[in-house]
Structures are given as C-alpha cells and as structure tokens.
Amino acid sequence: CKAMHVAQPAVVLASSRGIASFVCEYASPGKATEVRVTVLRQADSQVTEVCAATYMMGNELTFLDDSICTGTSSGNQVNLTIQGLRAMDTGLYICKVELMYPPPYYLGIGNGTQIYVIDPEPCPDSDF
C-alpha cells in the first residue's frame, strides 16, 4: 500500500435543503484506470461510512441507488454532493481515495471537510 495526497475544503455549510457539495482532489501518481472514492463521517471519535463508489477513468461516478451521495469525476478530482442532511448530521466528512487498478495500490485520505447543517425554522402558520 502506497500513500497518496488528497485535498478537500476545510469547511462547507449545507444548504437550507440539507445539501452539501465539496471537491475531493487527489495527486494521482500514475495511470490509474479504476478508482474508488469513499466518504467517511467522523463524529465523537466514531467513524462511519457514508457512501462509496468505484469508477473507471472517463466514466461517470455511480453510487448505489439508495445512496445519499451523488458525484461527478473530472481527471483527478471528484465533485461530491451529499443530500438529506439534518442538523444531527453535522460532522467531519473525510474523503478516502483508492487507486484500485492497475497495481500498485494507492491509498489517500483527506483531512476532512467539516459540514455544518442547520435545520430550517418551520414556517409560521399564515392566514392566507
């Protein structure tokens, strides 16, 4: 296993609709054709997997149908979007990138993006 640099933004604020987007960029050390991207959430020293996708270079990034993540890839950067977030989902979201094929295997883990989620205030009842 060889190490690889990964960069991602330090902080992102989710939209009022609970959507957060950020870029995950990695320093590809060679001609990888198969890449796996995983988003991990760290909160209270617990790390859980949020979503993961494997893609072939030049092809679309596809997450499972029931995933809360979507994304696109362009070269050695991945644009990730996480949906359905609520205030309780605030935490550090870490981008993990693996170059699966061809060998050698490379692993890179970013420093994480702190995503802040604020639940919208309910609209007051109106008389209209």
């Epitope: 990964v6 991602q8 870029v23 960029e25 590809s28 060679g30 990888a32 054709t33 070269g75 050695n76």
Partner: nanobody, 126 residues
Framework: EVQLVESGGGLVQPGGSLRLSCAAS????????VGWFRQAPGKEREELSC????????DYPGSVKGRFTISRDNSKNTVYLQMNSLRAEDTAVYYC???????????????????WGQGTQVTVSS
Amino acid sequence: EVQLVESGGGLVQPGGSLRLSCAASGDTLESFAVGWFRQAPGKEREELSCIGRTGEFTDYPGSVKGRFTISRDNSKNTVYLQMNSLRAEDTAVYYCAAERLVFHLCSLSEYDYDTWGQGTQVTVSS
C-alpha cells in the same frame, strides 16, 4: 481556453542540460496544474513530473527524480522543466499538459489532462 506551447528542446550531448518551457495563452496558468510527459518513437507516453497551481506541490516518478526539476512562474504564465545529466535514452518529444484544478495538487497520469501542447524534440547524442 488555455493553449500551451513548449520550447527549449534541441540537440544536447550526453551529460548536458536543457531547460524546457511551457508557455500558456488564452487563460491564466495559475488556475491549472501542469504536467510534463515525453514520448520516444515506438514507445508509450511517459510521465516525468507535475506541479500544482501554486507550485508548492510537485511530484516525480522514480525514473527521473534527482535529474529533472519542475518549477513555475505564474507571473510569466510559464512552467519549466530543468533536465540535467541527460542520457541518450532521454531522446523523445516532450509535451506539457494542463488540468484545471481547485486545490494545490497535481497528477502524473496522462489520463487526467485535457489540454496538451504540440511538443518539443529533445535529442541527446554525441
């Protein structure tokens, strides 16, 4: 859209040095990571080095580490490849390539670059 032009190639004796330049027009190069590659006749394109947007991150494969040095001058919209201790096997056409990135990293994979120069010939011979 950015366009790239390489220069500085030529004939050099074994053990000699050359500095290649990759000049950009049409856009500011500081938005792009830049890589240098080469291709010898009948061989695959080979990665040589890359440099991130700010110049703080560089990468080299083992084959040229210690002999080749990449640098950039964003004020001149140019990236350089300093090549020392040249050998006959360094003879090839040398290309630079650019990729628009958000952060400071760069890639050694030719698959990641979407803009390429036309190349400059380097011949190492006595």
